[in-house]
Interface confidence: low
């Protein structure tokens, strides 16, 4: 069956460059056309680039014209987008996509492949609790969590007592910092009557810093 | 450029419900007009195409019409596999312009959230930084409104807010909305306060705490 | 107004052999793809084959992929189809077409009348 495989996705300083490919099967790659399509983070879908079967003709969306180049390998089954000057908004999942055999719709979509551009440098998180008290109390329900803050680049991942507590449990999407870092909570609503005798762990990892941290939540000593 | 717009951006709906989007041309682009599903972090997958012609294995709950500027992709008895972000998209010229996306989300019924507040860790104040977090749980709809106020001095341009997927069991929204201050403008404040309101609310729901106290 | 004239069409016998053309008036091709469409009695018309811009060039149907050749002479403004090979199911009408888009969208502004092939023993 046809399959569209990406690669080449990652974190590009604003300026740099990066090559993405699309590795095609399951069809005859030459007689295709292929489109590039992006979604930034929480937004649309935003047409990018095409080249005809035979890559006589290209055309560009105005936002990356002169900046980007779309360029095809029918020996190898592959297309390329080539992102020069690149800039903070092309940060984006990049998606290429075959049309149906004439007609410009995409029936055929590859899994996507993610690119950051920032100029921050990868960084593993700080982890801080955030620790049950009256305050954080309502109705035999206590709630507590952890901070994840500062990393670069997306993503991390939270669980809770090695993944054995996941009831009540809310990871919030990561939200970027004005200093170009990462930021999430992780939080868990629990029986007030448990938190003198349950132990409450969150087990951060980073994966592109090698960061893993287990942080103990306990409700703050007066 | 063939500009595309869809309404609503948001459509709140139950299972076995008939729902409707629309999706407008900036000019006549005929029928060349195909529809699209995504699911968060998934790529999208083509419904339709030609305006109305069903794509292979793709149920016949979702029917397409419409020509020239208007058209509508409706969905005539909601599935719980249907709650999604939908696209249109042209292709009648070269740039092949998306319409900006509807999501289609579950009715659920009014949840007031359950707020707490939660201080800097001293972990954290030892770094410079105080973060202080207001949380939001399990409320519906989505809409809901945080204010900070330090020592009753409303707050702008120094939170940010964070709100999870619809969440698949009971339908409601958790938030987050955090405060970040240098530990020098933390120290200088005593009483912090984030002020909720919410259509589950009959009144603004305010938490909050004195710092250095427990 | 645009015109599109077809000719070329008749009988013929499988296996046998015919060339379509369809010349354009009040528009100049070169920057628009043109296609060829067919229609046999009682069916949807379908497409058969797009000849894109110049050096762009050409997609099939399956269905006729190897056995028809599309091909176009700008400066005659018109566009040919090359039916080799030809089997009873190409029994149709053959119309051509000329495209909205410079690229190719699949979106027709402009039809011509049909040429009716027939291919019988």
């Known amino acids: 069956q046809v399959q569209l495989v990406q690669s080449g996705g990652g974190v590009v300083q604003p300026g740099r460059s990066l090559r993405l490919s699309c590795a095609a099967s399951g069809f005859t790659f030459s007689r295709y056309t292929i489109h590039w399509v992006r979604q930034a983070p929480g937004k649309g879908l935003e047409w990018v680039a095409v080249m005809s079967y035979n890559g006589n003709n290209k055309h560009y969306a105005d936002s990356v014209n002169g900046r980007f180049t779309i360029s095809r390998n029918d020996s190898k089954n592959t297309l390329y987008l080539n992102m020069n000057s690149l800039r903070p908004e092309d940060t984006a999942v990049y998606y290429c996509a075959r049309i149906r055999d004439t007609a410009m719709f995409f029936a055929h979509w590859g899994q996507g492949t993610l690119v950051t551009v920032s100029s921050a440098s990868t960084k593993g998180p700080s982890v801080f609790p955030l620790a049950p008290s009256s305050k954080s109390t309502s109705g035999g329900t206590a709630a507590l969590g952890c901070l994840v803050k500062d990393y670069f680049p997306e993503p991390v991942t939270v669980s809770w007592n090695s993944g054995a507590l996941t009831s009540g449990v809310h990871t919030f999407p990561a939200v970027l910092q004005s200093s170009g870092l990462y930021s999430l909570s992780s939080v868990v609503t629990v029986p007030s009557s448990s938190l003198g005798t349950q132990t409450y762990i969150c087990n951060v990892n980073h994966k592109p810093s090698n960061t893993k941290v287990d942080k103990k939540v306990e409700p703050k000593s007066c | 450029d063939i500009q595309m717009t869809q309404s609503p951006s948001t459509l709140s709906a139950s299972v076995g419900d008939r729902v409707t989007i629309t999706c407008r041309a900036s000019q006549s682009i005929n029928t060349w007009l195909a529809w699209y599903q995504q699911k968060p972090g998934k790529a999208p997958k083509l419904l339709m195409y030609k305006a109305s012609s069903l794509e292979s294995g793709v149920p016949s709950r979702f029917i397409g019409s419409g020509s020239g500027t208007e058209f509508t992709l409706t969905i005539s008895s909601l599935q719980p596999d249907d709650f999604a972000t939908y696209y249109c998209q042209q292709y009648n010229s070269d740039s092949k312009m998306f319409g900006q996306g509807t999501k289609v989300e579950v009715k659920g019924t009014v949840a007031a959230p359950s707020v707490f507040i939660f201080p800097p860790s001293d972990e954290q104040l030892k770094s410079g930084t105080a973060s202080v977090v207001c949380l939001l749980n399990n409320f519906y709809p989505r809409e809901a409104k945080v204010q900070w106020k330090v020592d009753n001095a409303l707050q702008s341009g120094n939170s940010q807010e964070s709100v999870t997927e619809q969440d698949s069991k009971d339908s409601t929204y958790s938030l987050s909305s955090t405060l970040t201050l240098s530990k020098a403008d933390y120290e200088k404040h005593k009483v912090y306060a984030c002020e909720v309101t919410h259509q589950g609310l009959s009144s603004p729901v305010t938490k909050s705490f004195n710092r250095g106290e427990c | 107004q645009v015109q599109l004239q077809e000719s070329g069409g008749g009988l013929v016998q499988p296996g046998g052999s015919l060339r379509l053309s369809c010349a354009a008036s009040g528009r100049t091709i070169s920057r628009y793809a043109m296609s060829w469409f067919r229609q046999a009695p009682g069916k949807e018309r379908e497409f058969v084959a797009v000849a894109r811009r110049s050096g762009d060039g050409a997609f099939y149907a399956d269905s006729v992929q190897g056995r028809f050749t599309v091909s176009r002479d700008d400066a005659k403004n018109t566009v040919y189809l090359q039916m080799n090979s030809l089997k009873p199911e190409d029994t149709a009408v053959y119309y051509c077409?000329?495209?909205?888009?410079?690229?190719?969208?699949?979106?027709?502004?402009?039809w011509g009348q049909g040429t009716q092939v027939t291919v019988s023993s």
């Open positions: 077409a000329i495209d909205s888009d410079t690229f190719y969208s699949g979106s027709y502004d402009y």
